[in-house]
Amino acid sequence: AGVFELQIHSFGPGPGPGAPRSPCSARLPCRLFFRVCLKPGLSEEAAESPCALGAALSARGPVYTEQPGAPAPDLPLPDGLLQVPFRDAWPGTFSFIIETWREELGDQIGGPAWSLLARVAGRRRLAAGGPWARDIQRAGAWELRFSYRARCEPPAVGTACTRLCRPRSAPSRCGPGLRPCAPLEDECEAPLVCRAGCSPEHGFCEQPGECRCLEGWTGPLCTVPVSTSSCLSPRGPSSATTGCLVPGPGPCDGNPCANGGSCSETPRSFECTCPRGFYGLRCEVSGVTCADGPCFNGGLCVGGADPDSAYICHCPPGFQGSNCEKRVDRCSLQPCRNGGLCLDLGHALRCRCRAGFAGPRCEHDLDDCAGRACANGGTCVEGGGAHRCSCALGFGGRDCRERADPCAARPCAHGGRCYAHFSGLVCACAPGYMGARCEFPVHPDGASALPAAPPGLRPGDPQRYL
């Protein structure tokens, strides 16, 4: 166990032209605070992925009001260190994100407003117990100067804080096989006490009381050899007697997530989805209020004036999660139509439309009905990049400007005669046929092929085709 400590020295305009405008003004006084997020390893992870090593928020800095006309100076900083406690071994390589936040103190409805001013990130190697490391990072026109170190909490020592130290029992020397604990020469390295019965050949521990198995061995005390054959269980072998691995323990077995968090397995470990008000690798950090600035990525915090009442983060577009910590792949929802390409600009989505299409989602076909009228009561039908008019009765042509001859297509069957009519056409059927187009033969016994002739209509009467 130990603590990562971060000391912010200055935050202000970087060198070179294009000095940023002061983030505060006489009308909108503000103050700064910082958030640090640590992840193990040299991972190049997204800013919103979990801070698996831990995170911390600074106190608020002094209130600052811009002097009119003056360039933005180095801004007043919060007092003290940012401290991120770590419970397990210090990984030696880590990634960090340091965010500079502005709290505006004007007359906003619902209390102060927070906005992210700058975010810097990096990947570093650092041994615990070493001296302060100095760093300068730039984000746009801003520059952040800071120092950091990792130190072990007694009784842990060493570059990874995994060795334990105890006061000497004898004044002159340490016990057999145990070295003095540099730099605490008056203390001796203490042997780690693993779980009782843990195999000394096949097991080891990094924390007192645990028993972790070397590859090829399993079981609570690492005494069962693993055989890779004749095992069917999804997690591997199924029976200790055959030398097969007893299924589990999976990373989520026993639910490592505290405070009602739900556990999901990841390729390398597990991930806790925490209920509102809790965060951390295992949802172990609680008592968060809006004063702690729990909403990331510009989320607005509402409620939560005291640790017992929940806060709610209202996330800006593109972010989700109870703390606005997750970026949404909004383009994966395929919002753009007609071959338009989706651009996620951060503050908004945009569809880049293909030629001939327009609209927020490329939904309008410019080659179709827009700006085109169909004459004589015709209606425009869109489709396939070319407009089409559905013409009223008696009209035809591309724009329904031509008067149609309804009899031109010879619609009356079996020798029936066609008459143009104001409402369409009428077929006068030849003897022996009936129907709107004289399509039905009249049977010799007087019955027609129709189920029944409409009342009052004799076979052979002209049929109006409507």
Partner: antibody, heavy 124, light 111 residues
Framework: QVQLQQSGPGLVKPSQTLSLTCAIS??????????WNWIRQSPSRGLEWLGW?????????DYAVSLKSRITINPDTSKNQFSLQLNSLTPEDTAVYYC??????????????WGQGTMVTVSS | QSALTQPPSASGTPGQRVTISCSGS????????INWYQQLPGTAPKLLIY???QRPSGVPDRFSGSKSGTSASLAISGLQSEDEADYYC???????????FGTGTKVTVLT
Amino acid sequence: QVQLQQSGPGLVKPSQTLSLTCAISGDSVSSNSAVWNWIRQSPSRGLEWLGWTYYRSKYYNDYAVSLKSRITINPDTSKNQFSLQLNSLTPEDTAVYYCTRGGIVGAPDGFDIWGQGTMVTVSS
Amino acid sequence: QSALTQPPSASGTPGQRVTISCSGSNSNIGSNPINWYQQLPGTAPKLLIYSNNQRPSGVPDRFSGSKSGTSASLAISGLQSEDEADYYCAAWDDSLNGHVFGTGTKVTVLT
């Protein structure tokens, strides 16, 4: 991981047609989020985008205005590859030809994967 | 003729900060995201920055991008010898209905 493997001739005669193929592994030519490009580079013209093909419910193509009359980019779903055909070649078309993917969701213009490049010389 | 203009060369000593500019017009940089590519000698270009200021995974945070109006810039802070390469900006152009690249800037690390 995603890889693009180019194949095709290195020497083509003037007035003939250049045919290059780009085989995709680790992704799909019919992906709903990627775009598949051809780009060339020569000392005289620098980097030049030739065109792309992409799938969004159906396949679409776009070509550089200067080449529209003599370029075709075709996807081949069965072989998971896409090809470039450039007609009526002149010595001006001598360049290194690259196939690329624009595969970042929400940023199709960011060409994150590149083929190894094919040096094409147009000469009789 | 490229639609985006870059200075032909830039240089700095190790540890210095170098900035490369890219100038365009309303139809490209003014209305579309800008991307930056690094091309080491004898290799294909590599995406360095996309969507104005986003770094793909694996790109060191020494590289940062910004955009204002119709121009953009790439900054390399803490210059290192392996940064010696050609750098190109690129964007979609609404008028041409296609991608346009910058003329390229050769960065030299002075020792």
